[in-house]
């Protein structure tokens, strides 16, 4: 019981921190411009991985996409590789757990296979986690750089802009975002792993015992009959099948795109 | 057809309170950001403040704080003004501007002014 | 504050010459964000509140005859008037959009001969 409370409180805590991890990616406010030293701006400039916004006073927002690949900064192409690679590693470890769900049966698969599987789920989780809460890290450090370094922009060159403003940026909404959702994902995938280990089949320390009778030759192992074989008329599987479904349905329906704008 | 329409002139003695409208038209009320400018005869344009009648959020001009104070009512679509402890240094004609909303910040609808004489 | 200087501070001209006026602002008008300059211009005729010609240094409002052009960048803006019509006579005001309290210039009056 507690290793598939463990085991689905992983899943569901990793399903919301690779969500945050989606909406962080897609959110415009990575940087935002810093109103310390001039709090009276009438236009306020922020900026995301994909494109960088202004929002005037009457609160209107105009954004423009970073329609060059070449002429972006090496630490801003890594950060979004990064985050592209969090997303795709916990896409596909959500994949393998719902499947490694110990509340789900799928035809005769042994505890080993969803002990394997739930192990797999856990270590790309934390690699998940991990590539989320590097890539923010690394967006963070170079940040803090050009603020101190006070540059006018942060993508200088991009577009041949003209370095005339001193508009300094600091952290924004989408650091915190990606920070929290990547620690969730790396806590999933760790109660995954540890999941993984009251899944395991124990090993026992007597061999099968063979009974002879009547010139039939039929072997009782320990444990041999926890998978079952199928769903057939067995309505308890067939009820904890369906609430497997509920649990797929709401990973479609969690928010995969969020636009702050 | 949007139109910004002010109260009547004022006349009023030093140390007195005046309340001035601009009650809009043609256009969503909330929508818009509604600027007050003072201007001096035969001078200048001076920026009083703005209200945004969506939230009754205010700005104010750091010279104006304590002398003006904007408010709204959604209900008929008006903007108010009242400018407390006049002094002939308040005589002017003060307007009403609609903020545009894709006008890099600029006022695009102007309301015809109210005239204030601070006098005894 | 930023502080918005306009000259010459009148002008006379004869109908159909072509009109130029400037405007200095203490601080840079441009955005970095978008490359944008918030600067405005108004028209403001005898008795009459102003009117909104120009935006974002160079852009035309709507039904705004095409003689009058906007131009420049950062602290130094220019109105023109490529040909002077008698219903032009007016004083004209450039205003800093881009932080508050946003600011006036002192206007450049337009006399025509």
């Known amino acids: 019981m507690a290793v598939t409370a463990c085991q689905g409180l992983g899943f569901v805590v990793s399903l919301i921190g690779i969500a945050g991890i989606i909406a962080a990616t897609c959110m415009d406010q990575w940087s935002t411009q810093d109103l310390y030293n001039n709090p009276v701006t009438a236009v306020f400039n922020y900026q995301g991985l994909w494109r960088s916004c202004v929002r005037e006073s009457s609160g209107f927002t105009e954004c423009r996409g970073y329609f060059t690949l070449l002429g972006l900064p090496a630490m801003l192409q890594a950060v979004r590789a990064l985050m592209i690679v969090g997303i795709v590693l916990g896409a596909i470890g959500l994949l393998v757990s719902i499947f490694a769900l110990k509340c789900i049966r799928i035809g005769s698969m042994e505890d080993s296979a969803k002990a394997n599987m739930t192990l797999t789920s856990g270590i790309m989780f934390i690699v998940s986690g991990l590539c989320a809460i590097a890539g923010v890290s690394v967006f963070a450090n170079m940040l803090v750089t050009n603020f101190w370094m006070s540059t006018a922009n942060m993508y200088t060159g991009m577009g041949g802009m003209v370095q005339t403003v001193q508009t300094r940026y600091t952290f924004g909404a989408a650091l915190f975002v990606g920070w929290v959702a990547g620690g969730l994902t790396l806590i999933g995938g760790v109660m995954m792993c540890i999941a993984c280990r009251g899944l395991a089949p124990e090993e026992t320390n007597y061999k099968a015992v063979s009974y002879h009778a009547s010139g039939h030759s039929v072997a009782y192992k320990p444990g041999g009959f926890k998978a079952s074989t199928g769903f057939g008329s067995n309505t308890k599987n067939k009820k904890i099948y369906d609430g497997g479904a509920r649990t797929e349905d709401e990973v479609q329906s969690y928010p995969s795109k969020h636009d702050y704008v | 057809e949007v139109q910004l329409q002010q109260s009547g002139p004022e006349l009023v003695k030093p140390g007195a309170s005046v309340k001035m409208s601009c009650k809009a038209s043609?256009?969503?009320?909330?929508?818009?950001?509604m600027h007050w400018v003072k201007q001096k005869p035969g001078q200048g344009l001076e920026w009083i403040g703005y209200i945004n009648p969506y939230n009754d959020g205010t700005k104010y001009n750091e010279k104006f704080k304590g002398k003006a104070t904007l408010t709204s009512d959604k209900s008929s679509s008006t903007v108010y003004m009242e400018l407390s402890s006049l002094t002939s240094e308040d005589s002017a004609v003060y307007c009403c501007?609609?903020?545009?909303?894709?006008?890099?910040?600029?006022?695009?609808?102007w309301g015809q002014g109210t005239s204030v004489t601070v006098s005894s | 504050d930023i502080v918005m200087t306009q000259s010459p501070s009148s002008l006379s001209v004869s109908a159909g010459e072509k009109v130029t006026m400037n405007c200095k602002s203490s601080q840079s008008l441009l955005n970095s964000g978008n490359q944008k300059n918030y600067l405005a211009w108004y028209q403001q005729k005898p008795g009459q509140p102003p009117k909104l010609l120009i935006y974002?240094?160079?852009t035309r409002e709507s039904g705004v005859p095409d003689r009058f052009t906007g131009s420049g960048s950062g602290t130094d803006f220019t109105l023109t008037i490529s040909s002077v019509q008698a219903e032009d006579l007016a004083v004209y005001y450039c205003q800093n959009d881009h932080s508050y309290p946003f600011t006036f210039g002192s206007g450049t009056k337009l006399e025509i001969k």
């Open positions: 043609g256009y969503t009320f909330t929508s818009y950001i």
């Open positions: 974002g240094a160079s």
């Open positions: 501007a609609r903020l545009g909303f894709t006008t890099r910040n600029a006022m695009d609808y």
